[in-house]
């Protein structure tokens, strides 16, 4: 990178050059703030969406079991009941076989599982929505994380840790950006301040530039705002 | 030679002020922040503030405020401290630094000035 | 305000030994820090800044080490020149403060 501030004979610096007045801009790392926050927004979901899909497949897989528990409490239809230790023999007598032939289901205020094709496809076109909304938010993801724009066939795995990658190097740069900012805040890095830019930001700030006072210091003529922001891009 | 020269010692009584100065010389003085530090035997090394020589920013530790005025003259090279309300705790050296830890770093110490408050 | 703390305070070492001294900021300072030496009845030098970087001049036998909250400043075959006492300072934003000092003495 190229310091600002060049040595003379001796290691003095120089004075920058004016630079032409450029649009005010917020800097780099609230870009990468942003891109961090949709990447990491993108990976939840993606996460939530296949979550959820395990959850359904799970869901099918185990066909509601509908038949009285032991305790009277019916054990489909969501109740969660603690599971019972002592299993019961399972009486082969023909005699109650008969009975439990003859028991009538319906007065017990649920029907038998017999499986409507509506109500399948209905199910199938959820999951069917649901798939595609994982690979919207993988597809999604993908396009936000380094190469994976390019690289359609990257996995969902190779998504999610490229992802982690590219948010943790984002974290890191945020963390620069703190450090350097701080150091500008502390003095040890701000490069002296062309006369054409400060101009430039006087007459955006409005004249007369009022006196701006703080805890930290009494800021005369450039907010401390507009000098860290100034410095920022110096530094760049 | 890049130097930062300090005036001389100054004895001065409880209550009074003490204005000291830094002449840059080697190096333009408004290329870098000039930072104010101050050592004494109990609390070893103290930022009191830097300014901008540029453009005349300052900015103070807390504990200063009030107690120390940052200026400077950019026509002479010279940035001035002045130290008001002075009492015996302030009896130390102070020292003018030029400040600068970017790519190509600079940091130059003057020499110092003692400042001795006593009746 | 950021407390920075120098351990051991002091510290005897002969010519030619590798020593070894230790910076703790109170909070994540990230890489903000430098160690300046100073001589009895001098001003201080810079040695090292944004924690690893040597200022120019400066033997290579010195190294700066760590980030975050904890540093160290290493000299390697100590010179006759290098005893002295060794500061450390964050300039993790203001105000800037300086640690009480490791005093490095001739054994």
């Known amino acids: 990178m190229e310091s600002s501030a060049k040595m003379e004979s001796g290691g003095a610096g120089q004075q920058p050059q004016p630079q032409p007045q450029q649009p005010f801009l917020p800097p780099a790392a609230c870009f990468f703030a942003t891109a961090a926050a949709a990447a990491a927004a993108a990976a939840a979901a993606a996460a939530q969406s296949a979550q959820q899909q395990q959850q359904q497949q799970q869901q099918q897989q185990q066909a509601p079991q509908l038949r009285p528990a032991a305790d009277g409490q019916p054990s489909g239809g969501g109740h969660k009941s603690a599971p019972k230790q002592v299993k019961r023999q399972r009486s082969s007598s023909p005699e109650l076989m008969r009975c439990k032939r003859r028991l009538n289901f319906s007065g017990f205020g649920y029907s038998l599982p017999q499986q409507q094709p509506a109500a399948v496809a209905r199910r199938n076109e959820r999951e069917r929505n649901r798939v595609k909304l994982v690979n919207l938010g993988f597809a999604t993801l993908r396009e936000h994380v380094p190469n994976g724009a390019a690289n359609k066939k990257m996995s969902k795995v190779e998504t999610l840790r490229s992802a982690v990658e590219y948010i943790r190097a984002l974290q890191q740069l945020l963390d620069e950006h703190d450090a350097v900012s701080a150091a500008f805040q502390a003095g040890v890095l701000s490069p002296t301040i062309s006369p054409n830019y400060s101009n430039d930001l006087n007459s955006m700030a409005g004249s007369p530039v009022s006196s701006y006072s703080s805890d930290e210091g009494s800021y005369d003529p450039l907010s401390p705002e507009e000098q860290e922001l100034l410095d920022f891009t110096n530094w760049f | 030679e890049v130097q930062l020269l300090q005036s001389g010692p100054e004895l001065v009584k409880p209550g009074a002020s003490v204005k000291m100065s830094c002449k840059a010389s080697g190096y333009t003085l408004t290329d870098y922040n000039l930072h104010w530090v101050k050592q004494s035997h109990a609390k070893s090394l103290e930022w009191i503030g830097y300014?901008?020589?540029?453009?005349?920013?300052?900015s103070y530790n807390q504990r200063f405020k009030g107690k120390a005025t940052l200026t400077v003259n950019k026509s002479s090279s010279t940035a001035f401290m002045e130290f008001r309300s002075l009492t015996s705790e302030d009896s130390a050296v102070y020292y003018c630094?030029?400040?600068?830890?970017?790519?190509?770093?600079?940091?130059?110490w003057g020499q110092g000035t003692l400042v001795t408050v006593s009746t | 305000d950021i407390q920075m703390t120098q351990s051991p305070a002091s510290l005897s070492a002969s010519v030619g030994e590798t020593v070894t001294m230790t910076c703790r900021a109170s909070e994540n300072i990230y890489s903000n820090l430098a160690w300046y030496q100073q001589k009895q009845g001098k001003s201080p030098q810079l040695l090292v800044y944004a924690a690893t970087n040597l200022a120019d001049d400066v033997p290579s036998r010195f190294s700066g080490s760590g980030s975050g909250t904890q540093f160290s400043l290493k000299i390697n075959s100590l010179q006759p020149e290098d005893f002295g006492i060794y500061y450390c300072h964050h300039f993790y934003g203001s105000p800037l403060t300086f640690g009480a000092g490791t005093k490095l003495e001739l054994k």
């Open positions: 300014i901008n020589p540029y453009n005349g920013v300052t």
């Open positions: 630094v030029s400040l600068y830890y970017g790519d190509d770093p600079f940091a130059c």
